[in-house]
Structure formats: C-alpha cells, structure tokens
C-alpha cells in the first residue's frame, strides 16, 4: 500500500510542477521593472521568455513578441530551450508513468515492467525537474548581471531593446513559479524511483511448479521469481506464475486456468 | 463613445471643501481605464489632479495630495473629487477626463467653473 | 516633477502655411521597454475643453486630420500643423505621461496671420 501511495504522490507531484513549468514557460513576467525607488509608476515594463509588456497605469497594456530568431541573445534562447526540454521530458515522463501506476491495472503488465516504467518516469521527472531550474536559474543570472550595470545604453540581454539607465530589471513571479515548479517535479521524480524500488519483484530460491489438468505437455519452471532489478531487498514477494501475474497485496482475486501448488 | 459630465456648486467658501461630481455614460467606470480630474484658472495652464483608475486605485498630484480626494461610485458610475480647505488659488475650470493609451486624457467633460469667493 | 516648456508661447501663421510648435522636458520621456515616448499633444479653442491630438509623439488620435503630425524623442518634441486652417486657431498644449504627476507645458496659442 505504501508503494501504490507513493508513487500516486509521485505522480501527483510532478504533474503539479510540470504544469507549473508549463505555466512558467508561458508567462510575461520573467522579469518585471525595478521599482525601489519609485514604487507608483505610469509606465511599467515587463518581460518574458517570448514577448515583452508595457503596462500604463491608465490600463492599457501592449506586448510585443521577439519576431527575431538569430537576433535574439544566446543566453535567453538557452533558457527558452531549457524551458522546452524540461517540458517535453516532463510530458513524456507523465505518460509513461500513468502506465506504470499500480493502481492502473493494463492486461497483464509484469510488476517488473511496471517497476522498470516507475524508474524511467522517475528519472525523467529528475531531469524535467533540473532543467526547469537551471532555466530560472540562468535568467536570474542575467537579470542579477544587467541589475549592477549602470551604463546609459545597456544592453538588456533580453530582446535586444536598448535600455536606458533608470529602468532596471528584477526577478519576475515566472522565475519563482518555475523554482518550484522545478522543485516539484525534482522531488516527484525521486518518489517515483523510491516507488520503483517497492515494485521491484526480489530474487528468492524458491521454485516454482505450475500443473495443468489437460493432458498436453505442461511446462516445469524452476526460479519461478523473477530477478530483481536490484534495488535493495524488497517487502513484498510478488510470485510470477506462468498462467498470469498476480500479486500477494492484490484484494480482488482473478481465477486462473492454472492450479497454483 | 464615453461622455463624462461634470457636475457640483459653482461656488464654494474659503476653507471649505469642493466637492465636485463626474457622471460617465457610454461606458463603465470599472473598465480599463483611469478617470481624471484636471483644473485649469482662468486664463492660464493645465494642472493635472489626480485619478481613480479601473481597479479602485487612487494617484494624485503630490502638490494638492494632503488636500484631495478622489473616489467612485460603481453602482451609479460616477467618481467623485473632493479638494479641502480652498483658496482663491483653486478657482479654475474643473474637467474629469478619461485616461488610456498612452496615459493621454482621450476624453473630456465640457467642465465646470468653481470659484472660490467669500 | 518633469517640466515641460513649450516654445514659442504664441505663433502667427498665414493660412495654408506650416506652424511648429516646440515641447522640451527636463527627463527623458522614452519607455525602454517598448521605445515610445509618453507625449501627448492637445488642442484647445475657447469655452471648450481640450481634445486630444497625438499621443506617444506621434501617433495621431482616431479622427484628427492629417496635417496634424507630431515628431520627437528623449526630451524634445515638435507639433507640426502643415498647412494651417482657420479651424485650427487654438492653444496647443503638450503633456508627459511618463512620469508622476504628469505634467502639461504652458500652451502655444496659434493665430492667423
């Protein structure tokens, strides 16, 4: 039961951090104007990985896309493909791992392919996880770089727009979202390869005989267990017969054209 | 089209409070706009006052700021300045205007003439 | 407070003739973040409350003649009426809308010549 929960957990989890960098990835304020010094203004600057927003205390608010592709600074087309890579690994991670769910009964899937799917969602989620966060991460650098430059013209880093000295730029609610959107799925990941490790079926010395009433020849298999996958020892024995796999924590029973000894 | 009217006594004591009132039609003051209040004395400049804008938030100009007030009425769409303790000097041609790209006053009311006499 | 000067304070044109008004603030009204300058140009006739003409400096309000343009950016900003009509006898006022509390200049009065 603890392993269906924390892989349920799991799964949960990181559904909510990738939605999250999801909704990072989408979002117009990476960075918004700093506005320490002035903190009622009549214009204010924002801006995303996509498209940069001015926002005129009267309410209009115009936003403009980056139409430039090469013209655009390699840092922010880093981030934007951090961004993409996390979610695409993400997206990926949460389809295989709705496979692998426990409690999600698909023909008859070995607990060993299902331990196998657990890890490698969980492993994805990990890396989805981790490139959201070096995303954010690197975008804050820049926006830390650009904050101490006082040049007239700087050069923003984000767009190419030029910039002059009195509008400066901090960290935008889409760097926080995507730390913990990034934290989620990190953390989902690593419940899922936990999860991975109580699915696993362990080695034992046990044998196994399965008959069979008819008369046709019947099929003698010793080490009946399947091998482990080698993540430590494991609580529940999880007998794989050759008339279909049925697991000891299972509450309803399916009846078998074998006979079990 | 927003039309906005002006409306208040045209005369008002030293020392009392002006209180002044903006009816719009055509539109709704919860929109995305900001709605303003500018004087202009006889003869002279444009001062802007200060506005209410669509999310209730109130902006004046630090020059009258101890001395006004602006709010709205939603159910009856109008906004409201008050400007306490006047002079002669606050005698001038009160307009409410709206306020949206470009934070340009697109539309005005005719205004309304306060004059600040004993 | 941003100070806006207009210049010069009254202007006689002949009709049909060009008249440029001049704005100059003491900061910059350009917004980095999308490159438009917060200046608006207003015409106003007696008795009548001002209209609006141009804003961000050169974009001209919907139903404002053409020969109404406006150019400039930074700190200095220029009306231009190409080919001046009776109608167009007025006060012609320029406002940032850059920075609190916005601020108009003085007014230009244009007359016929």
């Known amino acids: 039961m603890a392993v269906t929960a924390c892989q349920g957990l799991g799964f949960v989890v990181s559904l909510i951090g990738i939605a999250g960098i999801i909704a990072a990835t989408c979002m117009d304020q990476w960075s918004t104007q700093d506005l320490y010094n002035n903190p009622v203004t009549a214009v204010f600057n924002y801006q995303g990985l996509w498209r940069s927003c001015v926002r005129e205390s009267s309410g209009f608010t115009e936003c403009r896309g980056y139409f430039t592709l090469l013209g655009l600074p390699a840092m922010l087309q880093a981030v934007r493909a951090l961004m993409i890579v996390g979610i695409v690994l993400g997206a990926i991670g949460l389809l295989v791992s709705i496979f692998a769910l426990k409690c999600i009964r698909i023909g008859s899937m070995e607990d060993s392919a299902k331990a196998n799917m657990t890890l490698t969602s969980g492993i994805m989620f990990i890396v989805s996880g981790l490139c959201a966060i070096a995303g954010v991460s690197v975008f804050a650098n820049m926006l830390v770089t650009n904050f101490w430059m006082s040049t007239a013209n700087m050069y923003t880093g984000m767009g190419g727009m030029v910039q002059t000295v009195q509008t400066r730029y901090t960290f935008g609610a889409a760097l926080f979202v995507g730390w913990v959107a990034g934290g989620l799925t990190l953390i989902g990941g690593v419940m899922m390869c936990i999860a991975c490790r109580g699915l696993a079926p362990e080695e034992t010395n046990y044998k196994a005989v399965s008959y069979h009433a008819s008369g046709h020849s019947v099929a003698y298999k010793p080490g009946g267990f399947k091998a482990s996958t080698g993540f430590g020892s494991n609580t529940k024995n999880k007998k794989i017969y050759d008339g279909g796999a049925r697991t000891e924590d299972e509450v309803q029973s399916y009846p078998s054209k074998h006979d079990y000894v | 089209q927003v039309q906005l009217q002006e409306s208040g006594p045209g005369l008002v004591k030293p020392s009392e409070t002006l209180s002044l009132t903006c009816t719009v039609s055509?539109?709704?003051?919860?929109?995305?706009?900001?709605w303003n209040w500018i004087r202009q004395p006889p003869g002279k400049g444009l001062e802007w006052i200060g506005y209410?804008?669509?999310?209730?938030?109130?902006n004046y100009n630090p020059s009258l700021k101890s001395r006004v007030t602006i709010s709205r009425d939603t159910s009856k769409n109008q906004f409201s300045l008050k400007l306490s303790s006047v002079t002669a000097a606050d005698t001038a041609v009160y307009y409410c205007?709206?306020?949206?790209?470009?934070?340009?006053?697109?539309?005005w009311g005719q205004g309304t003439l306060v004059t600040v006499s004993s | 407070d941003i100070v806006m000067t207009q210049s010069p304070d009254s202007l006689a044109v002949s009709l049909g003739e060009r008249a440029t008004i001049n704005c100059k603030s003491s900061?910059?009204?350009?917004?980095?973040?999308?490159?438009?300058?917060?200046l608006a140009w207003y015409q106003q006739k007696p008795g009548q409350p001002p209209k609006l003409l141009i804003y961000?400096?050169?974009t001209r309000e919907s139903g404002v003649p053409d020969r109404f343009s406006g150019s400039g950016s930074g700190t200095d900003f220029t009306l231009t009426i190409s080919s001046l009509q009776a109608e167009d006898v007025a006060v012609y006022y320029c406002?940032?809308?850059?920075?609190?509390?916005?601020?108009f200049g003085q007014g230009t009065k244009v007359e016929i010549k």
């Open positions: 055509g539109g709704s003051i919860s929109s995305n706009y900001a």
């Open positions: 209410i804008n669509y999310s209730g938030n109130t």
């Open positions: 406002q940032q809308a850059y920075s609190f509390p916005w601020t």
């Open positions: 961000w400096a050169s």
């Open positions: 900061q910059s009204l350009l917004n980095s973040g999308n490159q438009k300058n917060y």
């Open positions: 205007a709206t306020s949206y790209y470009g934070n340009s006053f697109i539309y």
